[in-house]
């Protein structure tokens, strides 16, 4: 369907592109000698960028540091030094720039303060960094300030002494609402969830922590859990891992009502050395990784039902190295239901897997057309594509970037990969899919940095090299043809590509430095592609595309999770602007139900290669370890439950006799007697 990529040659060359880009290339040289640069976008479609440069000299007793702050309001074409707005203070880079949610225009910078000071210091802006107010804090912050997603005036922070501090007026005044706090998170509706240690410390009390909730910013509290190891929020679910009574194992409990009632998740319990990890969550369901016992580096992915209680085994031997380690799990945001991850095979090599139906079935990635199988392949004609992600990067492979997809660039996935039986340690190439991962083509030879502009209308890439570079490549046809543009006559040591999050912009900033004998100078080049895409796209520039289409003859073609979607997509041959206001046009249509639209309810399972759910033999006639809402329950089921987010209608309805499964609640996680409310007086 798509040919091998070509660079320049006779490949749809764009007229006068060099002149057009030269007129739209803006250089900015930063007048400092900083060792590091961090960049943040402030707001959406505002064009405001903040750049913080830091220079640190570790002296014998203290370390001397200097920061500079720059601001652009034209997407990085010009920058103004605004260091004077923060009184030339040294900013602590480990806290980063805390940018407010949505388009609040709020920014918080945390300053370095001298050893004997009573508390920390922040600089706050609520006008997109035009002005800053210096505020001295009554505590030393341990973490970056966290904005409430619902109200950007509400902030929370943990202090170095484990106090939980809250501000209701964007950091002007602060109040300590609780001591001995280990972890705190904003929930919905300005709720704060946090764990507290009762006896010694967060580390010593792990597994004996209490989970608390405040719905009124610290006036009143409710203990919603005891014997807590950790907690997390995902989608509409609140999870807590809770220590068992009998031993050192722990189990996941789930709440969908902010901790008022809890149910025990039907997941394996884990021991001290193991972990749970929420890989992805939305309003419908959760992907949960459960680590294997022993230092195996892998575990099992389970997918939940709509309650977050019943879990189906999704993928075995899922690569996830030790707690807080590396996993390649990637949500392909450009197509619904698609995820890519890696498994660890028996021979300890690593293979990529993809699911198109939200974890229902996993398969290898199809071998790109016209590609050869590499040295990892036993059969030189049969192999698959393997994608490099976090694990490869952690293993120091020449992989400058993780896979990339954008919700508004429908179907496009870009990733480094190799073609064989397993992920290779050889130099990777860059591959692209234009159909959400069903088919792939080599896009660029060798490792590159890449980004998507104008909702997929332009793809930009820069070669990953340890030599200075001065060439940027771009494609207007989803990676089939590439043009090269020399953006400067003086090559720079490249450090990063920056474009506005959301992939709607037509500007790309190329960051790097020039180095002479003693000095290093930071420089950015911002290239605006607006004149390459001269006209706005019109109706004729778009074509209809059925997502997930694999068998056009079948009436169920394109049905995933009970419905199919037709998109209007830009033709590869159209060179025009989608524009900043582009909205993905899609037309959903409901599919008839089949057994594939149902998962097996608690106490049932699907035998290998079967579609019907049968009762688990080991559970027949037994009282089951099951706890719904913290009390004994009579659970009735017909063995099937609609897959979360599945919208099928009619068709097959797996009706069968409804069984009354008497379940015994074995969780004393939240005994009503243990629930108490407290006032902060």
């Amino acid at each position: 369907r798509r040919g091998a990529p070509a660079e320049d040659q006779d490949c749809g060359r764009l007229p006068d592109f060099i002149a057009k880009l030269t007129n739209n290339t803006h250089q900015h040289v930063f007048d400092d000698l900083s060792g590091s640069v961090s960049l943040s976008w402030v707001g959406d479609s505002t064009g405001v960028i903040l750049v913080l440069t830091t220079f640190q000299v570790p002296l014998v007793i203290v370390s001397f540091g200097q920061s500079k702050l720059y601001r652009s309001e034209d997407y990085g074409k010009n920058f103004k030094d605004i260091t004077n707005l923060i009184n030339n203070t040294f900013i602590r880079t480990e806290f980063g720039m805390a940018i407010g949610p949505e388009n609040s225009g709020k920014v918080i910078l945390t300053a370095e303060v001298s050893g004997g000071s009573r508390g920390g210091r922040v600089f706050r802006s609520s006008d997109f960094a035009k002005n800053f107010v210096q505020t001295d804090l009554p505590f030393h912050p341990l973490t970056q300030m966290m904005y409430s997603p619902q109200n950007s005036d509400y902030l929370l922070a943990l202090s170095t002494e484990n106090g939980l501090w809250v501000s209701k007026n964007f950091g002007e005044k602060w109040e300590e609402i609780h001591k001995a706090v280990c972890l705190a998170k904003w929930g919905p509706n300005n709720i704060i969830f946090f764990t507290t240690h009762v006896n010694g410390s967060c580390k010593a009390d792990l597994g004996a922590l209490e989970l608390w909730r405040t719905s009124d910013l610290g006036k009143t509290f409710k203990t919603i859990g005891v014997k807590i190891y950790s907690f997390g929020l995902g989608g509409r679910f609140l999870f807590a891992s809770v220590m068992a009574d009998k031993d050192t194992t722990r189990r996941i409990h789930v709440s969908t009502d902010q901790g008022d009632t809890w149910s025990m998740a039907q997941l394996p319990s884990v021991g001290q050395e193991q972990f749970y990890s929420i890989l992805a969550a939305n309003e419908d369901m959760v992907f949960m990784h459960v680590d294997e016992p022993g230092d195996t580096g892998f575990g099992t992915i389970f997918t939940s039902d709509d309650r977050g209680i019943v879990y189906s085994k999704s993928l075995d031997r899922h690569l996830y190295t030790t707690t807080g380690g590396e996993t390649d799990f990637t949500n392909v945001t450009s197509l619904r239901g698609v995820y890519i991850t890696s498994t660890l095979s028996e021979d300890n090599s690593i293979q990529s897997m993809i699911t198109f139906d939200q974890g229902g079935r996993w398969e290898h990635l199809r071998k790109p057309e016209n590609s050869k199988c590499d040295a990892t392949a036993k059969n030189k004609n049969e192999c698959s594509l393997h994608i490099h992600a976090s694990y490869s990067i952690s293993q120091k492979l020449n992989v400058p970037m993780a896979p990339l997809s954008e919700p508004n660039a429908v179907g496009i996935v870009i990733a480094h990969g190799s073609v064989g039986d397993a992920i290779s340690v050889m130099v990777p190439d860059v591959y692209i899919s234009d159909d959400g991962g069903y088919s792939w083509a080599k896009m660029l030879e060798g490792p590159h940095y890449y980004t998507i502009l104008d909702s997929g209308g332009i793809i930009v890439a820069i070669e990953h090299s340890n030599r200075p570079i001065n060439v940027i490549k771009f494609s207007t046809d989803e990676g089939q043809c590439w043009q090269s543009y020399v953006f400067t006559q003086e090559p720079i040591y490249f450090t990063g590509l920056a474009s506005e999050p959301g992939a709607r912009s037509m500007n790309i900033s190329i960051w790097g430095f020039t180095e002479s004998f003693i000095t290093r100078q930071w420089v950015s080049y911002t290239v605006d592609f607006k004149d390459i895409l001269e006209r706005n796209c019109e109706e004729d520039d778009y074509t209809t595309w059925l997502a997930h289409s694999t068998d056009p003859g079948d009436y169920k073609d394109g049905c995933i999770l009970g419905y199919k979607e037709q998109f209007l997509r830009l033709r590869k041959s159209s060179v025009c602007q989608n524009g900043r206001d582009y909205v993905v046009a899609k037309q959903p249509s409901v599919c008839p139900c089949s057994l594939e639209d149902f998962l097996c309810d608690f106490g049932y399972f699907r035998p290998e290669n079967a579609s019907e759910c049968v009762e688990q033999p080991e559970l027949k006639g037994h009282e089951l370890e099951f706890c719904l809402y913290g009390k004994e329950e009579h659970l009735t089921t017909n063995g099937y439950r609609k897959i979360p987010g599945d919208k099928c209608q009619g068709g097959m309805n797996p009706a069968r006799e409804v069984k009354d499964l008497k379940k015994k609640c074995t969780s004393n996680f939240l005994n009503p007697t243990k629930q108490n409310s407290k006032s902060n007086s």
């Epitope: 195996t296 580096g297 028996e346 021979d347 300890n348 120091k396 340690v425 130099v427």
Partner: antibody
Amino acid sequence: QVQLVQSGAEVKKPGASVKVSCKASGYTFTGYYMHWVRQAPGQGLEWMGWINPNSGGTNYAQKFQGRVTMTRDTSISTAYMELSRLRSDDTAVYYCARGGPQLRVAEYFQHWGQGTLVTVSS
Amino acid sequence: EIVMTQSPATLSVSPGERATLSCRASQSVSSNLAWYQQKPGQAPRLLIYGASTRATGIPARFSGSGSGTEFTLTISSLQSEDFAVYYCQQFRVLPPTFGGGTKVEIK
């Protein structure tokens, strides 16, 4: 065929550093990790770490962190292992060894250099 | 780290006889185990990987078995060139670790 040829024997004083080279031929040097393994006289084998010749990335065994540096020169397909602050118990034969083409959590070694004897003695 | 223990430390066998070498891991290494042969003054040579797969050019008299924590290398009929030290190595997790070796000597 794959060949790994190492530099000659070295005698060093305690506190000094030694740099052993390993020249690769017969395959694409940047396509495979290079590991270093040592063997003290009459003892077993001990893994020291790896270097990815392509990116220059390294991973050292805990025991050698801070003392070992692995580098490479891709233009001459050569990997280097430098061990500093030498002690008498660093006396050993040092081997370079090549892994396979797969990225693995840990590796076995298909091809070995002939070894370089490093003697640390005052 | 995973500790690999080989037994016996020395094995005396007559040429033409069968030799059985054992290797035990302190925790499961699945089938991620390799065997090497080393002769005096030489580098180790890969014999078996994946617990039971013979490396290229290795004679059929060498075979490996086992999984998890218990592994065996069998030399069905010892030839004169087989008298050497044999090492097992796990490649399940970092760091890769070797057993202390079994010396196979002429009886």
